[in-house]
């Protein structure tokens, strides 16, 4: 759920998520539009196809929770639980790696981007 | 061989506290990924699932009969326990353990039950 | 959670009639698992992950579905065949079990 994600991007990033990815860009955060603006912005849209996939399962991507590690730096899902917690917990920890990885491209001026800016053709999942 | 093996009181009181005991060889529950759950089944009806136990103690309980049930185990004797308080009438069926191991989403062993008849 | 509905509740077969069960799930899921239960027995681990067989199962038997609506076939009713058949989920927190369907031989 929202909780284990905020969680798990603050240990993985080291960047509070509500200060700086909620919203981020024209993906990060709730809902969606338009090209995404740069790198850190994909992985939320790649996130949002995660998301999106897994509510096709019948999954209830905002309330479930599950369990994980984070140990040096690494996530480890727990295996416990039901099919949707372990997906849930793998989409999230994709997209907390993701948002580290680019780190280094983080433009302060995507935060709270204005989304009607958020033009151009939506990417497919 | 993996076998699981129930036993309770057989009959109790409305009221009463239920104890069972689930008792496992052949495999042991310190192992990773390993896990026990209890369900139980009234006399000619359907399966209910009502809680389970992984290898480090984490437990899961069915949120319809939570706030009646306590699951345990004691690692050393590889033997699973549940506790239901306050049984009545509707609680009377045949309790079963079953082994689900965490990658799997299906229980592969299951004991040969454990019949409780509650009387008012 | 998920409620699982299987129809028929009882129904009769004949030897070599084929046979099919089905199982409706409440939301969508990801895989079904049965198992066949005989009278004073425990439930038997059949068919897992939809349509793989467990360990014994007879190759009479196979399993297919997806999303809400899964299903057991047997191609060729035999008398051992005769039992009750429950669907079960973990899709999602709490696991839960079909209402079981009887099958009985002619």
């Known amino acids: 759920g929202i909780l284990n994600l905020n969680k798990m991007v603050k240990q993985v990033t080291g960047k509070m998520p509500i200060l700086s990815y909620w919203p981020y860009g024209c993906h990060c955060g709730l809902g969606g539009r338009g090209q995404p603006k740069d790198a850190t912005d994909w992985c939320c849209q790649t996130h949002d196809c995660c998301y999106d996939h897994l509510k096709t399962q019948g999954c209830s991507i905002y309330k479930d929770y599950y369990r994980y590690n984070f140990s040096q730096g690494n996530i480890h899902c727990s295996d416990k639980g039901s099919w949707c917690e372990q997906q849930l917990c793998a989409c999230d920890k994709e997209v907390a790696f993701c948002l580290k990885r680019n780190l280094d491209t983080y433009q302060k001026r995507l935060r709270f981007y204005w989304r009607p800016h958020c033009r151009g053709q939506t990417p497919g999942c | 061989q993996v076998t699981l093996k129930e036993s309770g009181p057989g009959i109790l009181q409305s009221s009463q506290t239920l104890s069972l005991t689930c008792s496992l060889s052949?495999?042991?529950?310190?192992?990773?990924?390993?896990?026990v759950s209890w369900i139980r089944q009234p006399s000619g009806k359907g399966l209910e699932w009502l809680a389970h136990?992984?290898?480090?103690?984490?437990?899961r309980y069915n949120p319809s009969l939570k706030s009646r049930l306590t699951i345990s185990k004691d690692t050393s004797r590889n033997q699973v326990f549940l506790k239901i308080t306050s049984v009545d009438t509707a609680d009377t069926a045949t309790y079963y353990c079953?082994?689900?191991?965490?990658?799997?989403?299906?229980?592969?062993?299951w004991g040969q039950g454990a019949t409780l008849t509650v009387s008012s | 959670q998920i409620v699982l509905t299987q129809s028929p509740a009882i129904m009769s077969a004949s030897p070599g009639e084929k046979v099919t069960i089905s199982c409706s799930a409440s939301s969508s899921v990801s895989y079904m698992y049965w198992y066949q239960q005989k009278p004073g027995s425990s439930p038997k681990p059949w068919i897992f992950?939809?349509?793989n067989l467990a360990s014994g199962v007879p190759a009479r038997f196979s399993g297919s579905g997806s999303g809400t609506s899964y299903s057991l076939t047997i191609s060729s009713m035999e008398a051992e065949d005769a039992a009750t058949y429950y669907c079960q989920q973990y899709h999602s927190y709490p696991p839960t079990f079909g209402s079981g369907t009887k099958l009985e031989i002619k």
């Open positions: 136990i992984y290898w480090d103690d984490d437990k």
């Open positions: 079953a082994r689900r191991e965490s990658r799997y989403f299906y229980f592969d062993y």
């Open positions: 052949g495999f042991s529950l310190s192992t990773s990924g390993m896990g």
């Open positions: 992950r939809t349509s």
